[in-house]
């Protein structure tokens, strides 16, 4: 299936724009802003879909201890240079000539640099720590109703198989959902754990990317779960290189 | 409480195709996938493929070689099955089961369905 | 595809005395910790029912005597002490990787 056949749609990304003129009069959707062809039943690529965001205003935005070497999107929007594939390419520039490398959900990991700056591969994200912080309930939530519904979510929605869902922890009020995707274990038609973690995050902000369908209502056992606050860290396979100037 | 229930038994000649029926009932049809699985008389259980019904797309085990096509309508909260070139060796009962929460367990199935083929 | 192998095919036993059934699988269902492993009962006539999902969490309404075991690629189910009504075929299921798979079941009969 590449888009609802009857509305001619992309229930999976409402940036796009759909007419019948694949083979056959079947549905066929390109994304806003690159124009490529997506698969709309699974989730669109992050790289299609902040090329797609261009126009969008940027918006800032233990349990677990990320690891020195986890990055945070501090960067906010860019408009990213995509491959064939819709994947980030591993080195992005901006109109002054400013380049940095990416990671594969394209956050920097290394120093801003020059047009000779070098990105000799795409370095995977295997390791996404969402830490959510939700809003006061009248009592704590079951942590294996969390759990499982959570996962059920991850499944349903994102169609990320629970095997990449590594675990969910939970200390109310911070709930932290590890998704995890060694290069290995990806098959082809797996949902990359990035392009999930993404959906998640605007579904969380009330910015669904999901056509036609309401926000995201989160319940566990009937009891709405609000969030409140969210913060992405993100694991490379490679560590990030930074220069010592930026840490301090 | 969550009720899946299937259609009644068939008996079919070979070359002919079956369609089997799973209405849900009792929870958001459109919060869990739906499953088929078969067991043929004196084999182990099979499954056949599971369609997500929140999107309506379908995968599928490769054995069975583009001969089933699983759908739903969501408006009737129900999920289908159909088997195209029957042979002998389909006759089988034919389940549907839904996923659980978290770990792709099946928490509930119907009934099943028998369906025979013979000339 | 991953093949799961049950042991013993048949296991005879009385009420009150403890079952212990074996599902060894082809290659490894653990992901971070998570085993893809789940047990179900199947009577005659009947559709099966989940018993033990992710290799040893007891599903909602499941007697306590049942209880499972075991990661990677060496499974149990333990029943502790036989009620007339645990007399059935058990089944183990992957549900790590398409095709999701089913072992050929071990029957519990009374002696």
């Known amino acids: 299936h590449t888009a609802a056949q009857d509305n001619c749609t992309c229930p999976t990304n409402k940036m796009t724009v759909c007419s019948p003129d694949g083979p056959g009069g079947r549905c066929q959707c390109r994304a806003l802003g690159s124009g490529m062809a997506v698969d709309c039943s699974t989730l669109t690529s992050k790289c299609l879909l902040l090329k797609a965001r261009m126009s969008a205003p940027k918006n800032a935005r233990t349990l677990v201890r990320p690891s020195e070497h986890a990055l945070v999107d501090n960067d906010g929007l860019y408009d990213p240079d995509c491959d064939p594939e819709g994947r980030f390419k591993a080195r992005q520039c901006n109109q002054t000539s400013v380049c940095w490398c990416v990671n594969s959900v394209g956050v920097r990991r290394t120093d801003k640099g020059d047009l000779s700056l070098r990105c000799d591969e795409l370095v995977r994200t295997h390791h996404i720590l969402i830490d959510l912080r939700h809003r006061p309930t009248a009592g704590a939530f079951n942590h294996s109703d969390l759990d499982a519904e959570l996962r059920r979510l991850f499944r349903e929605r994102y169609r990320l198989h629970p095997k990449f869902v590594a675990a969910v922890h939970y200390e109310q009020p911070t709930i932290q959902i590890e998704l995890r995707q060694n290069t290995s274990q990806k098959a082809a038609g797996d949902v990359d754990i990035g392009d999930a973690a993404y959906y998640f995050e605007r579904d969380i902000k009330g910015e669904s990317l999901f056509q036609g369908r309401g926000g995201l209502d989160l319940r566990v056992r009937g009891e709405p779960l609000q969030v409140e606050r969210t913060l992405i860290y993100y694991l490379d396979e490679i560590p990030p290189k930074f220069s010592m100037k930026r840490l301090t | 409480q969550v009720q899946l229930v299937q259609s009644g038994a068939e008996v079919k000649k070979p070359g002919a195709s079956v369609k089997v029926s799973c209405k849900a009932s009792g929870y958001t049809f459109t919060d869990y996938s739906i499953n088929w699985v078969r067991q043929a008389p004196g084999q182990r259980l099979e499954w056949m493929g599971v369609?997500?019904?929140?999107?309506?797309?379908?995968s599928y085990n490769q054995k069975f070689k583009g001969r089933v096509t699983i759908t739903r309508d969501t408006s009737a909260s129900t999920a289908y099955m159909e088997l195209s070139s029957l042979r002998s060796e389909d006759t089988a009962v034919y389940y549907c089961?839904?996923?659980?929460?978290?770990?792709?367990?099946?928490?509930?199935w119907g009934q099943g369905t028998l369906v025979t083929v013979s000339s | 595809e991953i093949v799961l192998t049950q042991s013993p095919a048949t296991l005879s036993l009385s009420p009150g005395e403890r079952a212990t059934l074996s599902c060894r699988v082809s290659?490894?269902?653990?992901?971070?910790?998570?085993?893809?492993m789940h047990w179900y009962q199947q009577k005659p006539g009947q559709a099966p029912r989940l018993l033990i999902y992710r290799a040893s969490n007891l599903e909602s309404g499941i007697p306590a005597r049942f209880s499972g075991s075991g990661s990677g690629t060496d499974f149990t189910l333990t029943i502790s002490s036989l009620e007339p009504e645990d007399f059935a075929v058990y089944y183990c299921q992957q549900s790590y990787e398409d095709p999701y798979t089913f072992g050929g079941g071990t029957k519990v009969e009374i002696k």
């Open positions: 089961a839904r996923y659980g929460d978290g770990y792709n367990q099946f928490d509930y």
């Open positions: 290659e490894s269902v653990d992901s971070y910790g998570n085993n893809f």
């Open positions: 369609i997500s019904t929140y999107y309506g797309d379908a």
